[in-house]
């Protein structure tokens, strides 16, 4: 990394949790002095180029579309900027996960799915027939990898005290430590609704 420049960003334009054969668009922050941008995948500490954009598109952030997502394309990605024959800058890293490689787990809740702010709820992810050693809880629409992760089996995810932002549709996935970017099919969905008392009647009626 050159000098004290801030590290350029890399981002997925949709969820980084991608179904088998799905697609995702990756965006690298444009670097003014770079004459080309390479998209690298990092496997076993080895960098392999999987895409390359020339400077032609001016200040537009270079974009890369990964089609037909599979196990080989899951992993850690980084943008590599070429600013001279032997001079590079690098972005932060982005992790992409592929789902649909194993059977789906089951997601359940320890109470009703309509909550008031400040209340607690625990979601449990379990798999009767597949001995996953990790589970992740994902909220639909999130543009980053799920932060909720557990090594227990079954996995208990405590949410709370909740606020209105906790509302949403949740699913869980099972995976193995040895292959952290290869996940199961999504579990059944649970929709959590966090509402204050003003809207309680409306929620109950619907």
């Amino acid at each position: 990394q050159e000098g004290d420049f801030p590290m350029p960003f890399i981002s997925a334009k949709s969820s980084p949790v991608i179904p088998l054969d799905g697609s995702v668009k990756i965006q690298c922050q444009a670097i003014r002095e770079a004459y080309l941008t390479q998209l690298m995948i990092i496997k076993n500490s080895t960098y392999r180029e999987i895409g390359r954009r020339l400077k032609f598109w001016n200040e537009t952030d270079p974009e890369f579309v990964i089609d037909h997502m599979d196990a080989n394309k899951a992993g850690r990605y980084q943008c590599q900027y070429r600013i001279g024959h032997y001079r590079f800058r690098y972005s932060d890293t982005l992790e992409l996960v592929v789902t649909g490689l194993y059977g789906k787990p089951f997601l359940s809740a320890d109470r009703g799915l309509v909550l008031m702010p400040g209340e607690n709820i625990s979601l449990t992810c379990s798999s009767a027939h597949i001995p996953f050693d990790r589970f992740s809880l994902a909220k639909e629409g999130e543009l980053s990898l799920p932060q909720h992760q557990s090594g227990e089996h079954p996995a208990n995810f405590s949410l709370g005290p909740v606020d209105l932002n906790v509302s949403g549709i949740y699913r869980c996935y099972g995976w193995y430590n040895r292959s952290p970017y290869l996940w199961s099919f999504p579990s059944n969905a649970l929709e959590l609704v966090v509402t204050d008392s003003i809207h309680q009647d409306y929620t109950t009626q619907n």
Partner: antibody, heavy 120, light 107 residues
Framework: EVQLVESGGGLVKPGGSLKLSCAAS????????MSWVRQTPDKRLEWVAT????????YYPDNVKGRFTISRDNAKNNLYLQMSSLRSEDTAMYYC?????????????WGQGTTLTVSS | DVQITQSPSYLAASPGETITINCRAS??????LAWYQEKPGKTNMLLIY???TLQSGVPSRFSGSGSGTDFTLTISSLEPEDLAMYYC?????????FGGGTKLEIK
């Protein structure tokens, strides 16, 4: 299934104009750069024009710059090539091609082509 | 502009044989050479890019090698359906340029 279908070719006199169209289907059109590539009567392939996925930027080789204009309508999934000041050396089969989502200048899907003949 | 010289322009071989087609660039293009197949009645098909990366869905009997200025397309265990025109193309720098093509006939 990715499909690209060109239309609009025909016989034009030198100095004339013509607009080619390409209808795309089977993929998210707005995600991909699109190009025109032509094949001359002696079977040589020549890259003609490229347009960035968002439709903001265009690029041409020197021999068509100022005479050809590439454009796209992402809402209709259509790509166009407006050609003017046509010359006999523009006679060719014109192909619409999709750039891969990963590399500039790399074409992973092509149409069947439409023929332009420039002759008096 | 990068000039691409492709050879031979014509090639005839029998099923089961291994053939090679060569492309030479007028200046170094690193590894950025692609190969396409053109078959009558079908749309052009990307076979190989970045010198040696096989495009998804392309049979493994097609392979590419080379870097810098000299590149080779190898088709092993030739099949009757490989009858086609083959083109190389540099995707290193604008303007993108193609080789003159190789017509492969099956004996």
């Amino acid at each position: 299934e990715v499909q690209l279908v060109e239309s609009g070719g025909g016989l034009v006199k030198p100095g004339g104009s013509l607009k080619l169209s390409c209808a795309a289907s089977g993929f998210t059109f707005s995600n991909y750069g699109m190009s025109w590539v032509r094949q001359t009567p002696d079977k040589r392939l020549e890259w003609v024009a490229t347009m960035h996925s968002g439709g903001t930027y265009t690029y041409y080789p020197d021999n068509v710059k100022g005479r050809f204009t590439i454009s796209r309508d992402n809402a209709k999934n259509n790509l166009y090539l407006q050609m003017s000041s046509l010359r006999s050396e523009d006679t060719a089969m014109y192909y619409c091609a999709r750039e891969t989502g990963l590399y500039d200048g790399l074409f992973d899907f092509w149409g069947q082509g439409t023929t332009l003949t420039v002759s008096s | 502009d990068v000039q691409i010289t492709q050879s031979p322009s014509y090639l005839a071989a029998s099923p089961g044989e291994t053939i090679t087609i060569n492309c030479r660039a007028s200046k170094t293009i690193s590894k950025y050479l692609a190969w396409y197949q053109e078959k009558p009645g079908k749309t052009n098909m990307l076979l190989i890019y970045s010198g040696s990366t096989l495009q998804s869905g392309v049979p493994s009997r097609f392979s590419g090698s080379g870097s810098g200025t000299d590149f080779t397309l190898t088709i092993s265990s030739l099949e009757p359906e490989d009858l086609a025109m083959y083109y190389c193309q540099q995707h290193d720098e604008y303007p993108w340029t193609f080789g003159g093509g190789t017509k492969l006939e099956i004996k």
